[in-house]
């Protein structure tokens, strides 16, 4: 019982339970393939507990191994559209600091209109994650079709 | 050492480790797009630790942020079948209480025969999750092809 | 504060935080559909904390419920390639001990070039997981396109 109380009394952040789930805010201007995200209870079911948004990109606040997940659905899309506009690709990576820049997760749409995946990866405090959508098709802003999140798993 | 002992002595439920993995039981009668789920060690590798089933739908017992995941594969399906029967769509949402009704996760099959995704979402005690499959194609009942689960992540 | 300190002082393994993320090493010889994996910080962003590799296959060291996830992308692939070489199927299962052999997760590529999914499943110490790719197409070795991992979730 004492442990359960201690668990409740301690701020959750000290337990390392950093977590975020974001919804699409907007796409970037031309030549900027990045998706711009937003989160917070006022927006619906998105939230940030630990990580922060920096100009629409997700910045990590705690070192550790994270589960990163994403789903992106293309707007006004059919398998014909998707194949005609191929290649449309989504990549999630560390975009800053530049010294740690790397692609973590990459998927192409081919004849589908939705990609969804997840992976475990080490992230460090200050890492900023970017999600790049290349191609001419646009992502849906529906919150049940396009979302991006991270969950701290262990140190 | 004391913490490890405390952790073992406390019932897991008090740590908030609610988790469930379900297998398909059956589809609904006509006009009911819901999938009906089942779980328990007697059925194979499905289980419920915390959440419960209410007439084949998953009911949450603990407030918190959950990772919700699902995979649904269509029975007797090829890319030709899938495109001919388009649109076939899978949506996961809170279906009761009505005041909290919302779609959490939505995917279309397009030319594929399997959808799989996951997301983080806040759920409250008493929320019932429904999985709606719309279209004329039927889901496979193979336990390695069709499954649905939740995992409590943090308060 | 005491709990946070205790948490830091205890070896993470005693908290049951077993986790692994692997990258593709190579495919098997003819007639062996298994993918062979590798992991470790020297290789990039892959790692093993608890589980071990046994001849390229992942062996579990702690009983519990695990989240198993995988993404496999086919090399030199288009939707035309994928449909022409159909069926190409990926299955994740327990392959040893033989008494516990079972398929946990199965997906076909149909007209797509990437599959990605995840599921919760009970695993026991000594279980070895195999990932079988059947068909004539080969998987990409890019670390952001093909990966396989497990995360201990609860006892």
């Amino acid at each position: 019982q004492r442990f359960a109380q201690a668990q409740q009394q301690l701020p959750l952040e000290s337990l390392g339970w950093d977590v975020a789930e974001l919804q699409l805010n907007h796409t970037g201007p031309q030549q900027d393939p990045r998706l711009y995200w937003q989160g917070g209870p006022a927006l619906g079911r998105s939230f940030l507990h630990g990580p922060e948004l920096d100009k629409g990109q997700l910045r990590i606040h705690r070192d550790g191994i994270y589960m990163v997940h994403i789903q992106v659905t293309l707007a006004i899309c059919s398998s014909t559209t998707a194949s005609r506009h191929h290649p449309t690709t989504l990549a999630v990576g560390i975009c800053s600091p530049a010294s740690r820049s790397i692609s973590l997760l990459r998927l192409s749409f081919h004849q589908g209109c939705t990609i969804a995946s997840q992976r475990l990866t080490p992230l460090a405090r200050g890492d900023t994650l970017c999600t790049n959508l290349t191609g001419t098709l646009l992502p849906s802003r529906n919150t049940d079709e396009t979302f991006f999140g991270v969950q701290w798993v262990r140190p | 050492q004391r913490f490890a002992q405390a952790q073992q002595q406390l019932p897991l439920e008090s740590l908030g480790w609610d988790v469930a993995e379900l297998q398909l039981n059956h589809t609904g009668p006509q006009q009911d797009p819901r999938l009906y789920w089942q779980g328990g060690p007697a059925l194979g590798r499905s289980f419920l630790h915390g959440p419960e089933l209410d007439k084949g739908q998953l009911r949450i017992h603990r407030d918190g942020i959950y990772m919700v995941h699902i995979q649904v594969t269509l029975a007797i399906c090829s890319s030709t079948t899938a495109s001919r029967h388009h649109p076939t769509t899978l949506a996961v949402g809170i279906c009761s209480p009505a005041s909290r009704s919302i779609s959490l996760l939505r995917l279309s099959f397009h030319q594929g025969c399997t959808i799989a995704s996951q997301r983080l979402t806040p759920l409250a005690r008493g929320d019932t999750l429904c999985t709606n499959l719309t279209g004329t194609l039927l889901p496979s009942r193979n336990t390695d092809e069709t499954f649905f689960g939740v995992q409590w992540v943090r308060p | 504060q005491r709990f946070a300190q205790a948490q830091q002082q205890l070896p993470l393994e005693s908290l049951g935080w077993d986790v692994a993320e692997l990258q593709l090493n190579h495919t098997g010889p003819q007639q062996d559909p298994r993918l062979y994996w590798q992991g470790g910080p020297a290789l990039g962003r892959s790692f093993l904390h608890g589980p071990e590799l046994d001849k390229g296959q992942l062996r579990i060291h702690r009983d519990g419920i695990y989240m198993v996830h995988i993404q496999v992308t086919l090399a030199i692939c288009s939707s035309t390639t994928a449909s022409r070489h159909h069926p190409t199927t990926l299955a994740v299962g327990i392959c040893s001990p033989a008494s516990r052999s079972i398929s946990l997760l199965r997906l076909s590529f149909h007209q797509g070039c990437t599959i990605a999914s995840q599921r919760l499943t009970p695993l026991a110490r000594g279980d070895t997981l195999c990932t079988n790719l059947t068909g004539t197409l080969l998987p990409s070795r890019n670390t952001d396109e093909t990966f396989f991992g497990v995360q201990w979730v609860r006892p």
């Epitope: - | 398909l24 039981n25 059956h26 589809t27 009668p29 006509q30 029975a75 004329t136 039927l138 009942r141 | -």
Partner: nanobody
């Protein structure tokens, strides 16, 4: 105890037709998704055709255009019409309540060339 019983199998020449029937001892067919599976010698059982309670049906690509699944809820029957049979269709055919582990004993279909 609900039982399923298949009939209509037999020996037929390539290009010929057969109609398999499946009857249930209770009104289970009316309320359930029904399926036909087949198992060829030395192979795994495979799903061939499926039909939902409303009559919407689907058959495997390997038999598309040749096999048709149908149901008669009033008679509590499900059928598999097999035309233009090929030697590779040789197998034991099973009727199944798809979302329940309820199976018939099977009926042998042999297609000679």
């Amino acid at each position: 105890q609900v039982q399923l019983q298949e009939s209509g199998g037999g020996l037929v020449q390539a290009g010929g037709s057969l109609r398999l029937s499946c009857a249930a001892s209770k009104s289970i067919i009316r309320d359930n998704v029904m399926a036909w599976h087949r198992q060829a010698p030395g192979k795994q059982r495979e799903l061939v055709a499926i039909i939902n309670t409303g009559g919407s049906a689907n058959v495997d690509d390997s038999v598309k255009g040749r096999f048709t699944i149908s149901r008669d809820n009033a008679k509590n029957m499900v059928y598999l019409q097999m035309n233009n049979l090929k030697p590779e269709d040789t197998a034991v055919y099973y009727c199944n309540v798809y979302y329940r582990d309820l199976w018939g004993q099977g009926t042998q279909v042999t297609v000679s060339s």
